[in-house]
């Protein structure tokens, strides 16, 4: 015998209290597949979350984050605070990158400047809290007559700036 509930389409549930009649999902609930015996409660997007897609009888609501925060996790399960470029997020809030590190995004951690000398290159543009150093040609390429550009002073050794 075929289960009568298998005939209930998405957006309905098989109501055991009414002789397994297919009943529409109540407000603020949904069923995304047929043959369901219950409807699922719609996700509520509130506070740090905002609604990206409204709940319908056949699909759950989708949330993103209120401006000032960004999504983390599958389906935007969490919202995390944005910081400014040149900062990283800590439990104490947004903090400036330490000297010798940078972050060019509103999220993520401060990363060390590229060490140009490891590639046998010189520093063409010094790094900042927001930008990595730009490595230039190797010092050997800058022999007299090879270029009229005066190489800048090398960047200071990374150290911690006061917070």
């Amino acid at each position: 015998l075929q289960d009568p509930c298998s005939n209930c389409p998405a957006g309905t549930f098989c109501d055991n209290n009414r002789n397994q009649i297919c009943s529409p999902c109540p407000p603020n609930s949904f069923s995304s597949a047929g043959g369901q015996r219950t409807c699922d409660i719609c996700r509520q997007c509130k506070g740090v979350f905002r609604t990206r897609k409204e709940c319908s009888s056949t699909s759950n609501a989708e949330c993103d984050c209120t401006p000032g925060f960004h999504c983390l996790g599958a389906g935007c399960s969490m919202c995390e605070q944005d910081c400014k470029q040149g900062q990283e997020l800590t439990k104490k809030g947004c903090k400036d990158c330490c000297f010798g590190t940078f972050n060019d995004q509103k999220r993520g951690i401060c990363r060390p400047w590229t060490n140009c000398s490891l590639d046998g290159k010189s520093v063409l543009v010094n790094g900042t809290k927001e930008r990595d150093v730009v490595c230039g040609p190797s010092p050997a390429d800058l022999s007299p007559g090879a270029s009229s550009v005066t190489p800048p002073a090398p960047a200071r050794e990374p150290g911690h700036s006061p917070q």
Partner: nanobody, 123 residues
Framework: QVQLQESGGGLVQPGGSLRLSCAAT?????NYWMNWVRQAPGKGLEW???????????YYVDSVKGRFTISRDNAKNSLYLQMSSLRAEDTAVYFC????????????????SGQGTTVTVSS
């Protein structure tokens, strides 16, 4: 169902005080970092303060340091924000929000928040 419900907002004069409360239901508050965030009219969301599970660590955005105090009563499953020396720029909707699993280790994401309570500072 996991829920947070804020209360205690209202109209207050500059220099005045308010105490916001947040009641947690459907989960054990003592297992989570908790946060207050706010949204001023026409602005983005701003993190205000957080507190760790047992209340031994508390951190604040610079603009409220020395004026706001975050606290919690795990026995009552409640979070609080005592606000004093209020300024016009503190006018906002205030939300309490739970730190998600792994908060402070892998991320600083918030996974549950309430509907908010409105604080208006005006003479």
């Amino acid at each position: 169902q996991v829920q947070l419900q804020e209360s205690g907002g209202g109209l207050v004069q500059p220099g005045g005080s308010l105490r916001l409360s947040c009641a947690a239901t459907g989960f054990t508050l003592s297992n989570y970092w908790m946060n207050w965030v706010r949204q001023a009219p026409g602005k983005g969301l701003e993190w205000v303060a957080n507190i760790n599970q047992d209340g031994s660590e508390r951190y604040y955005v610079d603009s409220v340091k020395g004026r706001f105090t975050i606290s919690r009563d795990n026995a009552k499953n409640s979070l609080y924000l005592q606000m004093s020396s209020l300024r016009a720029e503190d006018t906002a909707v205030y939300f309490c929000a739970r730190g998600g699993e792994g908060y402070g280790v892998d991320h600083y994401g918030l996974d549950v928040s309430g509907q908010g309570t409105t604080v208006t500072v005006s003479s």
